[in-house]
Every structure is written in C-alpha cells, then in structure tokens.
Amino acid sequence: NECPELQPPVHGKIEPSQAKYFFKDQVLVSCDTGYKVLKDNVEMDTFQIECLKDGTWSNKIPTCKIVDCRAPGELEHGLITFSTRNNLTTYKSEIKYSCQEPYYKMLNNNTGIYTCSAQGVWMNKVLGRSLPTCLPECGQPSRSLPSLVKRIIGGRNAEPGLFPWQALIVVEDTSRVPNDKWFGSGALLSASWILTAAHVLRSQRRDTTVIPVSKEHVTVYLGLHDVRDKSGAVNSSAARVVLHPDFNIQNYNHDIALVQLQEPVPLGPHVMPVCLPRLEPEGPAPHMLGLVAGWGISNPNVTVDEIISSGTRTLSDVLQYVKLPVVPHAECKTSYESRSGNYSVTENMFCAGYYEGGKDTCLGDSGGAFVIFDDLSQRWVVQGLVSWGGPEECGSKQVYGVYTKVSNYVDWVWEQMGLPQSVVEPQVER
C-alpha cells in the first residue's frame, strides 16, 4: 500500500519530506514566500493530500503561482509608473506613485514607492497599504511674475497664468426684487475653497444687518483672463458661503469669507492655489512690495459716484494688476483719522499704496488677494484681501487702500476648511 514518490511543485515544498509514503500518510503542500498554492483555479496558502488504501494519492500535487497584486489603485491627481519590465504586478514588483507636477505635490515628501508584498497587496514603507495624498501646490504660477524692482505706474494687463489663483465671484441675488447683481474677486486656496472679503458675499441690504447671500446665487470663475470670453474658464457654483462671524459692516473689521465650491476644480497652468501665510499678528512688513489683480476700475479719473451710477460699464475686460508697497500702520491710521467719516484702521487691517497716488485697487477689485513673494519658500503668499478705501476717487493722493490682514485669520480659515494643520503643511508658507 505504498504511494508513488512525490515531486514538490516548482517554488514549493512538501512536508514531511519522506523516502516512502504509506496508507494514511498525509503531506502538506506549501509554496515559497511570494507564491500561492493553486488548485483547480483556487488560490490557497496550503493544500493537504493523503495516501489512500489503494496506493494512490487523494489529489494531484497543486502548482505554486506567483502572488499578483493586480493593477494598483488610481491616485487622485497622481500618476503610476512601473519600475519592473512589462508592467509586472507580481511579487516584489515595484511601482512609483507621483503627483501631477507642478500642480500637485506628495504629502510629507513620501517616496511614492510601493512593492508587491507576499500577501498580494501594494505596500509602502511609511504608509503601508494606504495610498499617498497629492496636495495642490500653492503660490507657484506657471508663468513667472514680474520682477519687483521696477515700479509699475497704474495698472497693467496681466498675462494668462500670471495670477492662477485669481477668482471672479459673481453674485446674482434673485431673491431681491428687483434682482441684484454684483461681483468681486477671490483667491483659490485649494481645489475646493476660495478666500474673499466678507463684504463681497454679504447680502446688499437696505439696513446694516450682516446676512450672507444664498449659496445658489454665487458663481465662481477660475482661470479667467478676459471677462468677455468665459469659454476657457472653469465655472463653479457654491456649496457653502462662510462669512467671518464678527464681520462688522460699520468699520469692515474681520472682512474675510470663504466659498466652498460644489466640486473640486482641476488644477493646471491657469488654475493654481495661492499659499496662506503663517499665523503672524504683525502682518506684512512696511514697505514690502505686493501685487494685486482684479477686473475693477482701471480709469483713475472715474469718481466713485460715476462708478456706482454706471454699474459695470467702467470695469476692465482684461485682468489688471498693480504693484503696491505696504504702508506703515501708524501712517495709514493718521491719514484716515484726518478725514471726515468713521474711518478706523484696526489691527486686522493693513494699508498699501503710494503717498502720491496714481496706483490703487478700486471698486470691483474687492476680495482679491494682495500677494507677497516669500524668499524662503519661493512662493507667493496671500497677505491681504482688498477691503476698502477712502471717500475720494481711487488712486487719490495720500488715500491708501485698506486690506484685510490674512495672517490674523489663518487658524479660522483652516478650521472652516476642516483640515488639520499637519495635513496642510505644504500649503503653509515655510
């Protein structure tokens, strides 16, 4: 009652290994690391056979098949490259995830290398079986912003891609009778969030109550250059409109708000986020130069009353930008205190502009980002949001533009976006 000699499968072994096997002897077939027992197209870790009374084995010896991790999972905003020839996905094969550069960067500078494990799963040394995360790169336009040595007099046309974070926010309040329509600017912070001024998203009421406009009445355009041609732009509706809870219409203190987009927008050369600053109560240093872009008034001779009475007719078709220095806080406070009207410049604001005038932000630029280049991180950082200005026409002598000091609100912004600080480290100015 002796059974025939057994040959272990290729890449496998049989235990116990004996010279002879008799009735009722049992053997266990197993495979080397990275291989699985395959019997009747069923994968298993081990397979047992027995020597029968009639001197035959209860089953044929199974084969050992190399473990296959199969096609790796898709990475949002990422790519996969196979390190092994023929795009193999079997044991010890290697793949590399990378993010769609230069628009996305891998969180925590992960290598992105995954190896097919003996268990049949793609494994990374740090993340295990979890996929990496591609976060939007911020503050790095595909087109270089101009040198900040030479001063720009007045505004000039922005080339497409120069301000890829620039958003046009259009509010059409159909709940009003008659319908009300206005617009402002904003800055893209991530694929789903826009930073802007609260006064842009406050319902334009006949009283001083602060009520946000309904999200249904907000449309955001990104990647827009010429307002006459919106075909190349990405337009998105709003999922949420969040005004700072302490926004005060009487002095525009806490003039900051967020719009969450209905769907994340695809990033590209004309649509990229700007970086948020570090939490810094001082804000930008005096005399630092920053850039502001907008579709607001570009004619310095137009008075505020003319702008208001003519509606949107005096707006720029092409995105304009201007370079402005930060004004010392005391100087700005003094310049406004000397004016009639309640013009308090609070610690949540800073001023920018030139004593002699001629360059300024104006109506319609509201909510746009005042960006400063950070030498350390080599990124553009949103330090201000266009908030308000004096009673005289824009660009008047000794009338500085006033901006919301974004660095005072970094924690509030992250909190609203629902992202822990650790996850968003690449977004923060380093």
Epitope: S175, R176, T208, I249, Q250, Y343, W388
Partner: antibody, heavy 114, light 112 residues
Framework: QVQLKQSGPELVKPGASVKLSCKAS????????INWVKQRPGQGLEWIGW????????KYNEKFTDKATLTVDVSSSTAFMELHRLTSEDSAVYFC???????WGQGTLVTVSS | DIVMTQSPSSLAVSAGEKVTMSCKSS????????????LSWYQQKPGQSPKLLIY???TRESGVPDRFTGSGSGTDFTLTISSVQAEDLAVYYC????????FGGGTKLEIK
C-alpha cells in the same frame, strides 16, 4: 406677483394673547426677513421686530421683547406674531412687510376690550 | 437708541407746488465703507399700508414717480416732491436702518 396676506381682525380680552399671521407668496420666502410694525389709531409707525426665515433669527425693538414673539412656518411660507398679556395700549393695526419693505400686508386690526 | 425727528409735523400746499420735508437723526446714518446712508422714506395714504419711496437716502424704489427725490447725508435728510399731485395727500415717514429700525413721527401733507 408678490403678496403678503394678513389674518383678519381680532377682538380680544385684556390679559389674553393673540397670534397674527402673514402669508407670503410670489418671492423667495426664506431669503427675505419679515418685519412687523405697529400703528395705533391716528398715530405713527413703530417697528416691533423682524425674523429671518432661513434660520429663524429674530431681532426685536427692546420695547417689544416681552410683548411679541415672532415665528415662521417655512413649509407654508407664513410668518406669525404672538402678542402676550394684552392691554388697551396694544389696540392697533399691525402690519407685516418683506423684501426690505418693498411689500406690505394689508394690516390686521387688534382691539383689546373687555 | 437713534431718535428720528421730522419737521414740519404737517404742511399744506397747492397742487403743482414744490414741497420739502426734513428728517434729522440723533447720530450719523452714514457708513463710510459702503458710502451709504441708511435712511428710508415711506408714504402712507389714509386707510392704506405704508409704501416705500426711497432707500439709502436717495435711491428711488422701482415704480416710484421721479417727482419724489431723497437727499442728505449724515444726520440731515430731505424728501422733496417737485410738483405735488392730489394723490400725494399722505403722511410721510422717515426710518433709520443703521441700528435696527426707528421711524420718525411723520409729516402730514395736505393739499390746499
């Protein structure tokens, strides 16, 4: 077209309460607050308070905080004002208005008498 | 609280005449940031509900005849009817909306 239709006249006894209604139609009810205004016979207008139907936020004239309670029923686009502990001083016409006073109800006369 | 004072309390004019009435507030109703004065004017004809004529001190409500003009800023405001018509017989109220709402006592316009 926009309409605010108020409930009919009320004759109530001193010390009692009364609940007035204001049914809105023809506009976005939740996006526009409802104001309530009092006018005693031969007198001027007095603002009582407002309610914002989207979230139920209310604001009151201090004088009326203990006198009036404002509520809404969004499902029927109706605003309500309940007046408590009525006295002869509360005898007046009460108006509701909306879309920032662009539209007014016809008024409800409340007479407090024993 | 903001107190609104209207004057005169009543006036009588002939049809076709120009009429002005005044409204003064106990504090400024101008918000520099919005460049708006938070003051409205209302007309209430006998036995009717009030009707909004002017908001933000000078913006005419749609459908209001252009003979009605609002002006002023800060604490002093004026409603002008350039050529009074018989149907303008009414009480005119101003209202501040700078801090909650307060109505003035009204100006009664009578036609001679």
């Amino acid at each position: 077209q926009v309409q605010l239709k108020q409930s009919g006249p009320e004759l109530v006894k001193p010390g009692a309460s009364v609940k007035l209604s204001c049914k809105a139609s023809g506009y976005t009810f939740t996006s526009n607050d409802i104001n309530w205004v009092k006018q005693r016979p031969g007198q001027g207008l007095e603002w009582i308070g407002w309610i914002y139907p989207r979230d139920g936020t209310t604001k009151y004239n201090e004088k009326f905080t203990d006198k009036a309670t404002l509520t809404v029923d969004v499902s029927s686009s109706t605003a309500f004002m309940e007046l408590h502990r009525l006295t002869s001083e509360d005898s007046a016409v009460y108006f509701c208005s909306s879309v920032e006073d662009s539209y007014w109800g016809q008024g409800t006369l409340v007479t407090v008498s024993s | 609280d903001i107190v609104m004072t209207q004057s005169p309390s009543s006036l009588a004019v002939s049809a076709g005449e120009k009429v002005t009435m005044s409204c003064k507030s106990s504090q400024s109703l101008l918000i520099s940031r919005t460049r708006k004065n938070y003051l409205s004017w209302y007309q209430q004809k006998p036995g009717q509900s009030p009707k909004l004529l002017i908001y933000w001190a000078s913006t005419r409500e749609s459908g209001v005849p252009d003979r009605f003009t609002g002006s002023g800023s800060g604490t002093d405001f004026t409603l002008t009817i350039s050529s009074v018509q018989a149907e303008d017989l009414a009480v005119y109220y101003c209202k501040q909306s700078y801090n909650l709402y307060t109505f003035g006592g009204g100006t009664k316009l009578e036609i001679k």
